[in-house]
Amino acid sequence: LNDLNVSPPELTVHVGDSALMGCVFQSTEDKCIFKIDWTLSPGEHAKDEYVLYYYSNLSVPIGRFQNRVHLMGDILCNDGSLLLQDVQEADQGTYICEIRLKGESQVFKKAVVLHVLPEEPKELMVHVGGLIQMGCVFQSTEVKHVTKVEWIFSGRRAKEEIVFRYYHKLRMSVEYSQSWGHFQNRVNLVGDIFRNDGSIMLQGVRESDGGNYTCSIHLGNLVFKKTIVLHVSPEEPRTLVTPAALRPLVLGGNQL
C-alpha cells in the first residue's frame, strides 16, 4: 500500500501559516486505523524527525512539533491527515505518513512535500480611494469543502464589524456571499473558494477602513484564521501632469 512511488503532492506555505497534509487511504475492508506515524525528512543529509504518532486513542506530538500538530482526519474513516500550525522555515521537507491496520502487516504510506516561503507581510498600506487585496489562503493537499469564509474588521472604534461572509450549505448546495455595513458594495471575493482561498478585494478605501481584518476559513469543524493590519494614508495630492509641471522654468525679469 505504498503511495511513495507516485510523485507526492506539494504544498507551499508562508512562515506562520498552517498546512493540512492529507493521509487518507481507501480500504475495501471494514478495518479501522490502528496506528499512525508522521515523520519529516528534511533532506540535505539532515536526520529524519519524528512529528507525531497515534495509537489507542492517544495522539502524541513530538519535540518541537508539540502544540503545533494535530490529527485532523476522521480516524474511524481511514483519515490520518495532519494539521501543522505556525509553520517555521525548519519545517520544510517531505512528510511521510504511515498507517497501520490492526492484524495486518501491510503499511499504508503517503508523502507530502512542504515548501516554506518567508513570512507574508501582516501589515498592508493603501491610500484613501485606492483598492487593496487581502489574502487568506488555507493550504491543504485535501480537497475539502469550504463551508464558510468570514472577514471581521476591528478599527479604532472598538466595535467589531462583519466585512464579508460566504456560506456553502452542503446539503442544499446553496452558496451565499455578502458584504456588510459600511463595507457594502466595496468588497468582492477574489479567491477561489474551491482552492480554500478566501482572499478579498476592498475598493474605494476610506480613512475609517484602517484597522485589523481577521479572516476565518471554515472547512467543516476545522477553522483557519489570519489577521491583517491595514494602514490607510491620506489621499495622494492630485497633480496635473504637464510638461511645465515636469520641467521647472527659470523666469527672467521681463517674463510673467
Epitope: 496506528k35 506515524d37 515523520t39 495509537y55 492517544l58 502524541v60 506530538p61 513530538i62 508539540q66 492484524g103
Partner: antibody
Framework: DVQLVESGAELVRPGASVKLSCKAL????????MHWVKQTPVHGLEWIGI????????VYNQKFKGKATLTADKSSSTAYMELSSLTSEDSTVYYC???????????????WGAG | MVLTQSPASLAASVGETVTITCRAS??????LAWYQQKQGKSPQLLIY???SLEDGVPSRFSGSGSGTQYSLKINSMQPEDTATYFC?????????FGAGTKLELD
C-alpha cells in the same frame, strides 16, 4: 545521566490511598511517555498504564481502571500514580518507566526507576 | 495478548550458548523487546524490534523471530548474565510481559 527517581517505601492502612511519585532527571519530560509497571512474584510484570506529560493523554490497563490514577506535573517534571482502596494485593514493587519512540510504531522502555 | 516464555528457568556454564523463547498468542509484527532483571534491580532493555541491540548491550546478546515466535540468544554465557529475562510485546495495549526465565550459572 537520564534518571527516574521514585518515592520511597510507604506504609498505609487497608482501604486508604497512596500517591507514588517519579521525578524525571536530565531529559525533556514532555517528550516521552511515562508508564507504570507492577511486579509481583505471582503475576510477574504487569503494565498499569501510560501518561504522556506533553499532551496529558492517558491509557489504562482495564485491570487497573479505578485502582490507579496517573497524573503529571510538567513544572516539576514529576509523574504520579495514585492507588486507591488499598488491600494486601497492592503491596508490592511499582516501577515508573520511560518509553522511547523508535519510529514506525515501535516503542520500548529504555529507562526504569529503582522501584 | 498472552506471551508464553520458556523455559521458566535454566542453568548454563560459562561460555555456553543459551536460547530463551517467547511465543505470542497473536502476530505481533516484530513489536517485541527483551529485558534483563538482576536480583533486587529494575529491568534493563537488551533487544528492541525483536532483533535490534540496545546501545551499550554486549554483542553476545541477539534477538530473532517473527510473527508469533521470538527468541533471545546469549552466545557465550558470562557470570554477569545471571538474571531473569522477560519478553514484552508493544504491538497493542494492554502491553504484556512473559512470565520470565531465570538464568543461573551452572
Amino acid at each position: 545521566d537520564v534518571q527516574l527517581v521514585e518515592s520511597g517505601a510507604e506504609l498505609v492502612r487497608p482501604g486508604a490511598s497512596v500517591k507514588l511519585s517519579c521525578k524525571a532527571l536530565a531529559y525533556t519530560f514532555t517528550d516521552y511517555e511515562m508508564h507504570w509497571v507492577k511486579q509481583t512474584p505471582v503475576h510477574g510484570l504487569e503494565w498499569i498504564g501510560i501518561i504522556h506529560p506533553g499532551s496529558g493523554g492517558t491509557v489504562y490497563n482495564q485491570k487497573f481502571k479505578g485502582k490507579a490514577t496517573l497524573t503529571a506535573d510538567k513544572s516539576s517534571s514529576t509523574a504520579y500514580m495514585e492507588l486507591s482502596s488499598l488491600t494486601s494485593e497492592d503491596s508490592t514493587v511499582y516501577y515508573c518507566t520511560r518509553r522511547r519512540y523508535y519510529g514506525s510504531s515501535y516503542w520500548y522502555f529504555d529507562v526504569w526507576g529503582a522501584g | 495478548m498472552v506471551l508464553t516464555q520458556s523455559p521458566a528457568s535454566l542453568a548454563a556454564s560459562v561460555g555456553e550458548t543459551v536460547t530463551i523463547t517467547c511465543r505470542a498468542s497473536e502476530n505481533i509484527y516484530y513489536s517485541l523487546a527483551w529485558y534483563q532483571q538482576k536480583q533486587g534491580k529494575s529491568p534493563q532493555l537488551l533487544i528492541y524490534n525483536a532483533n535490534s541491540l540496545e546501545d551499550g548491550v554486549p554483542s553476545r546478546f541477539s534477538g530473532s523471530g517473527s510473527g508469533t515466535q521470538y527468541s533471545l540468544k546469549i552466545n557465550s554465557m558470562q557470570p554477569e548474565d545471571t538474571a531473569t529475562y522477560f519478553c514484552e510485546q508493544t504491538y497493542d495495549v494492554p502491553l504484556t510481559f512473559g512470565a520470565g526465565t531465570k538464568l543461573e550459572l551452572d
